[in-house]
Every structure is written in C-alpha cells, then in structure tokens.
Amino acid sequence: VPLSRTVRCTCISISNQPVNPRSLEKLEIIPASQFCPRVEIIATMKKKGEKRCLNPESKAIKNLLKAVSKERSKRSP
C-alpha cells in the first residue's frame, strides 16, 4: 500500500495503472494543507479493498473529480 505515516503527505508514490471507475469502491480527496503541499487522491478498489494513490492530473481522475464537484454543488444551499 503506497501510504506512509512517517512523511507529511499520505502518498509516497502515485499509481500510473489505469483505474476502471466501475472497480472503485470509493475515492478520498485530501486537499493540500500546511502538512502536504499537494492534493492527494486515494482510491479504494472493490477487489480486496486495495488502496491506490492516483494522479490528480490524469484525464480519468479529472473526469471523476468533475462528478464530485457536481455532487458538491447539488448539496450546497
């Protein structure tokens, strides 16, 4: 699992493996902060609950994040 508790960022390495959105259990978005200067995207896969750190700049992830922003705007008053 490419996660670390010893460094400030959660992700040590970014997976370049393509992610089939249908195989995603969930997506967690950790915004940039004083502890980690970059946005981190952590995918939990349905199969075995494997966690992967994904590249926020990839086209696939940008499309998934587009759907997230739509969901956020639906919930905002």
Epitope: P21, K59, A60, A67
Partner: antibody, heavy 126, light 110 residues
Framework: QLVESGGGLIQPGGSLRLSCAAS????????MNWVRQAPGKGLEWVSS???????YYADSVKGRFTISRDNSKNTLFLQINSLRAEDTAVYYC??????????????????????WGQGTLVTVSS | QSVLTQPPSASGTPGQRVSISCSGS????????VNWYQHLPGTAPKLLIY???QRPSGVPDRFSGSKSGTSASLAISGLQSEDEADYYC???????????FGGGTKVTVL
Amino acid sequence: QLVESGGGLIQPGGSLRLSCAASGFSVSDTYMNWVRQAPGKGLEWVSSIYSDDSTYYADSVKGRFTISRDNSKNTLFLQINSLRAEDTAVYYCARDKEYVTSTGGAYYYFYYMDVWGQGTLVTVSS
Amino acid sequence: QSVLTQPPSASGTPGQRVSISCSGSSSNIGSDTVNWYQHLPGTAPKLLIYNNNQRPSGVPDRFSGSKSGTSASLAISGLQSEDEADYYCAAWDDSLNGLVFGGGTKVTVL
C-alpha cells in the same frame, strides 16, 4: 437519444462497422456501451468506452471488436472483425449514467445504463 | 450460462405480486449495485431500477428492487398486462472486469 446503424448480412470472417449517433448529450463526456442480444438469448455486454478513452471488452470479443468514438460527429462506433455465426445478434448502444454520493470525505460512484438505442441487427451467415 | 442467475419465467394474474430473484457472487452483486432492465422484443431495453432500489422518474411504484449480500430481487406488485416482458438484472463483475447480466426472466400475465 441514440440511433444505431450499420447492421446487415455478412459472411463468416467478414467485417462490419456499427455506428451509434447520439443527440441531446455529448458522447465525449460520458461512458458508452455496446450490448447485444442473440436470437432467443439474453442481453450480453460487449464493450465500454470511458470519457478518458479507456476501453473494456467481453472475453468473447476481445481482439476482434474495437470500440471508438468520433466526438465531432457525436457518434460511437463498434468495429467488428473476423465475424462468427455466434456474433449474430441485435446490437444496442447504451449510455452509462454516473452519479456520486458522499459520506464524510469519501465519494462513491454508481453507474447504470439509462438511455438505449433501438438496436441494429447483424446476421453472420454464408 | 449467465454469471447472474435468474429464473427463466414467472407469471401471475392481474393484480398479483410477482418476484424475480437474481443470484450472483461476491465479485459482482456482492461488491456492486444492481440495476434492472425491462425489455420488450423489438424495442430498446428500459431502465427499471438502479442502485438496487431506486426508480427512475416515470417508472411506476409497483416496481421495487432490493439487495441482500450476493442476491437481489425485483418485485412487481399489482401486476398489469403491460408488464409482460423480459426482465434482466445487471452488475459489474470485478473479477471478469466486465458488466454481467442475468439470463433474463420472462414475465407472463395470465
């Protein structure tokens, strides 16, 4: 709305390109699928193309079928090569609807085919 | 042989309740939501239930869906003659990396 075309009678080993013209939404922004139904059989998923251009195929068609799209024409395609008798079916294109729910900081994605075409018949026979 | 198992047929008289089962495994129904489609021969399949139990607008509330573990079911209460059709369950299979359908259930209104 989705309208398929390109079906017909073709000999075993032949090739065919099916088209699916979309209106009312953009094929580039959505996930698109091909699903088929052989005579007297049930629905069978064939292939999907996602908005990042990644493609997926059923094992039965892998290496023979190619899904693609032309964003300028707002059209989905299925190139079918090395046709076999068992490929005889009505071929439907269908749009995947994506929706997202959230709990805490986690986002969950769900998909379902909400728009279907009327289908185009491909008959493989000598 | 379909990955998801449905009974080939179901029937009832008008007004009756009919239930259709859909049995799968941990790699499909167990880890994904189930969608149900209604199909009349010669027409486009129609989405009936999504996300296990949600009805799209325009689908009568006579149709309901549920899921438990690796099985799902579709219920039609107050059966009507226009409900005569084939019904398919579907889910993503993470082992096959593809969408899988049940074999379909033909509903007949007696």
